[in-house]
Interface confidence: low
Amino acid sequence: GELETSDVVTVVLGQDAKLPCFYRGDSGEQVGQVAWARVDAGEGAQELALLHSKYGLHVSPAYEGRVEQPPPPRNPLDGSVLLRNAVQADEGEYECRVSTFPAGSFQARLRLRVLVPPLPSLNPGPALEEGQGLTLAASCTAEGSPAPSVTWDTEVKGTTSSRSFKHSRSAAVTSEFHLVPSRSMNGQPLTCVVSHPGLLQDQRITHILHVSFLAEASVRGLEDQNLWHIGREGAMLKCLSEGQPPPSYNWTRLDGPLPSGVRVDGDTLGFPPLTTEHSGIYVCHVSNEFSSRDSQVTVDVLDPQEDSGKQVDLVSAS
């Protein structure tokens, strides 16, 4: 006869491991007992359990409550056992020794591999600001046994670097994603992908990129200078910019206070019917917690009685 077993049994942490040992004997042969032992190199043999044809299952005190026979129906020639709730410390070499009658003893070894699935974590880097050089966007760490694979899935252009730390029974892998921040990256997903044989599918953690920036400011409303004449109603200046965080707007007049009747509504400056006192230099100040910008325009209200062209100067400053 001969023993049938597996070279390697692989289970995920917390699952039950079936340690197979089946004696395929000739007609009339009987199995008297099956002894299971842990036989890691250099540590001698430690008995796990013994299945006796007459007296049943015996379990070592070290494994009390954790070793069982497979559920019935059972074949008398089947010496397999179940190791409940596998833990990392169970990983190692096991030996099955079968005593048969009349053929004698047979033995076989298998390796139990306990997979420890990773619990990945993603840590965003420091605040991203446009104008920075190569900057850490996020790091992703996963520890498991065997070592997990950590990669990145994103449309964003960047560079990755990985490092691994080996522990006694596991390995931690950290991957960093570096990029040069630009406003186009705002709202873009950066996904850490962790692969591991103990996972049914890859684990994915997504971080949404936030890049602080503030665009140059400009003022709209003076495109047709002939519209800015005495008596015109509904004249307005609009300050144009964009930023992250969204910017706030403030209007001032460089050559004095804002004239009475001029309304400030966020990015818009609304004028009452125009008079010559509305002529002047107006400044739009745009700011967020990242930066601030200014744009100034010169308004020259035309008197239709006069035959002179209006001058418009546009100046932007940071």
């Epitope: 993603l122 965003p124 605040a127 997903p189 953690i205 997504t206 971080h207 949404i208 936030h210 917690e289």
Partner: nanobody
């Protein structure tokens, strides 16, 4: 899950002051940005102010110069000092916090009523 609990609302006369507080339940993760929104009857919820972990602040134009936001990172608490209150400041004030964990997740408090009336 992060819980946000506001306090400090009430009735105050125009020109008066109030200080709102918002305490976040302790989290093992960093609360990235905390701040305040408000909603007046019949109107949409509007932004008031926010503050980053580093103490950088941002305000809506309507409250700039009158309201001051501050933060105690060790307690995950944010404050809104409201001075020179006006009738138009009457609203339910909501605390908000963004949790950086697996991407930004925003949490909201239940709100505290502020009424400015003589």
């Amino acid at each position: 899950e992060v819980q946000l609990v506001e306090s400090g609302g009430g009735l105050v006369q125009p020109g008066g002051s109030l200080r709102l507080s918002c305490a976040a339940s302790r989290s093992t993760f960093s609360l990235n940005i905390m701040g305040w929104y408000r909603q007046a009857p019949g109107k949409q919820r509007e932004y008031v102010a926010t503050i980053t972990t580093g103490g950088s602040t941002n305000y809506a134009d309507s409250v700039r110069g009158r309201f001051t936001i501050s933060r105690d990172n060790s307690e995950d608490t944010v404050y809104l000092q409201m001075n020179s209150l006006r009738a138009e400041d009457t609203a339910v004030y909501y605390c908000t916090a963004e949790l950086v964990r697996r991407g930004p997740t925003t949490y909201w408090g239940r709100g505290t009523q502020v009424t400015v009336s003589s």
